[in-house]
């Protein structure tokens, strides 16, 4: 594939990555699918600086990120190591709460209104952020 050197239309460049911010909500899996079809992924937060950048753009709105524990341990969608990486959970989170009455626990992470993270039911229709890295090889040509 060709190397991506600038961000797509309607995406925001920051620190050699491109970000796209939704204006409506989808379930985590639909948001994940949307980003992957854009040759991107749900945002992976690797630093306090990136956290503040994303937080500034999303405002005080629940927003999905690319972090989940649907298969057991917490995992970032791009393979970034969770255990050694940046974290910004709210106090007492993640708690895998079962008391919501929707079945199961809470397996998907989102930014809360103050930017800190919470785990929630993956079916909830929250906004989402896609991220793709500049200078990486694009998996697909832009037009077919």
């Amino acid at each position: 594939g060709s190397e991506r050197t600038c961000c797509p239309v309607n995406w925001v460049e920051h620190e050699r990555s491109c970000y796209w911010f939704s204006r409506s909500g989808k379930a985590w899996a639909d948001a994940d699918n949307y980003c992957r079809l854009e040759d991107a992924h749900l945002v992976v937060v690797t630093s306090w600086e990136e956290q503040k950048f994303v937080q500034h753009h999303i405002g005080p709105v629940n927003t999905w990120m690319g972090l989940h524990d649907q298969n057991g341990p917490w995992k970032w969608v791009d393979g970034t190591d969770y255990e050694t990486g940046f974290k910004n959970w709210r106090p007492e989170q993640p708690d895998d709460w079962y008391g919501h009455g929707l079945g199961g626990g809470e397996d998907c992470a989102h930014f809360t209104d103050d930017g800190r993270w919470n785990d929630d039911v993956c079916q909830r229709p929250y906004r989402w952020v896609c991220e793709t890295e500049l200078d990486k090889a694009s998996q697909e040509p832009p037009l077919l």
Epitope: V9, S22, S24, A27, A29, N33, Y34, L37, E38, L144
Partner: antibody, heavy 113, light 107 residues
């Protein structure tokens, strides 16, 4: 509530052209990739084309490549399919779909001499 | 292209029956699979997404399972309004492809 309404179908002769439209409402159109999907009479479903939310990434099924053109106008919450060089085998009900979540009721395209 | 096969192609069942429909992908598709219900002259309706997540507003008698290449839709107790055609859709890569459908009618 979410609504997708297709229009523009009808009877056309082989080699002719049609332009299908899909009017979207009840959701944030610019946050959704869109698809055209068709179903020939008595047959299964066939994906036809995809366009991403900003209109810059497009894919087509091999069966329509070079003949059909997908486009969208986010300001008008509308999706289009320009169909040229139509063939009898293009006869089908054409559905628009937002992501793979919401579908319209479809519009019938009949290609016959 | 990823081929989707679906079985059975049709089945006859009674109200209250447990019904299971299977889709198989010719190669791994993660969990990028949806199940849809279609009634004559109507728009398809998504029942299940991401292989096992229930679409909002869909009755809990519908469930999905599977990952990779084999997927199942189960209706735990068939209701009169469930007689319809069901199909799967993979959307992991282009071209998106559908299963040929399963028609569920009254025994």
């Amino acid at each position: 509530q979410v609504q997708l309404v297709e229009s523009g179908g009808g009877l056309v002769k082989p080699g002719g052209s049609l332009r299908l439209s899909c009017a979207a409402s009840g959701f944030t159109f610019s946050d959704y990739y869109m698809n055209w999907i068709r179903q020939a009479p008595g047959k299964g479903l066939e994906w036809v084309s995809y366009i991403n939310s900003n209109g810059f990434t497009i894919y087509y099924a091999d069966s329509v490549k070079g003949r059909f053109t997908i486009s969208r106008d986010n300001a008008k919450n509308s999706l289009y399919l320009q169909m040229n060089s139509l063939r009898a085998e293009d006869t089908a009900v054409y559905y628009c779909a937002a992501d793979t979540i919401y579908w319209g009721q479809g519009t019938l395209v009949t290609v016959s001499s | 292209d990823i081929q989707m096969t679906q079985s059975p192609s049709s089945l006859s069942a009674s109200v209250g029956d447990r019904v299971t429909i299977t889709c198989r992908a010719s190669q791994g598709i993660r969990n990028d699979l949806g199940w849809y219900q279609q009634k004559p002259g109507k728009a398809p309706k998504r029942l299940i997404y991401a292989a096992s997540s229930l679409q909002s507003g869909v009755p809990s008698r519908f469930s999905g399972s599977g990952s990779g290449t084999e997927f199942t839709l189960t209706v735990s107790s068939l209701q009169p309004e469930d007689f319809a055609t069901y199909f799967c859709l993979q959307h992991t890569s282009f071209p998106f492809t559908f299963g040929p459908g399963t028609k569920v009618d009254i025994k």
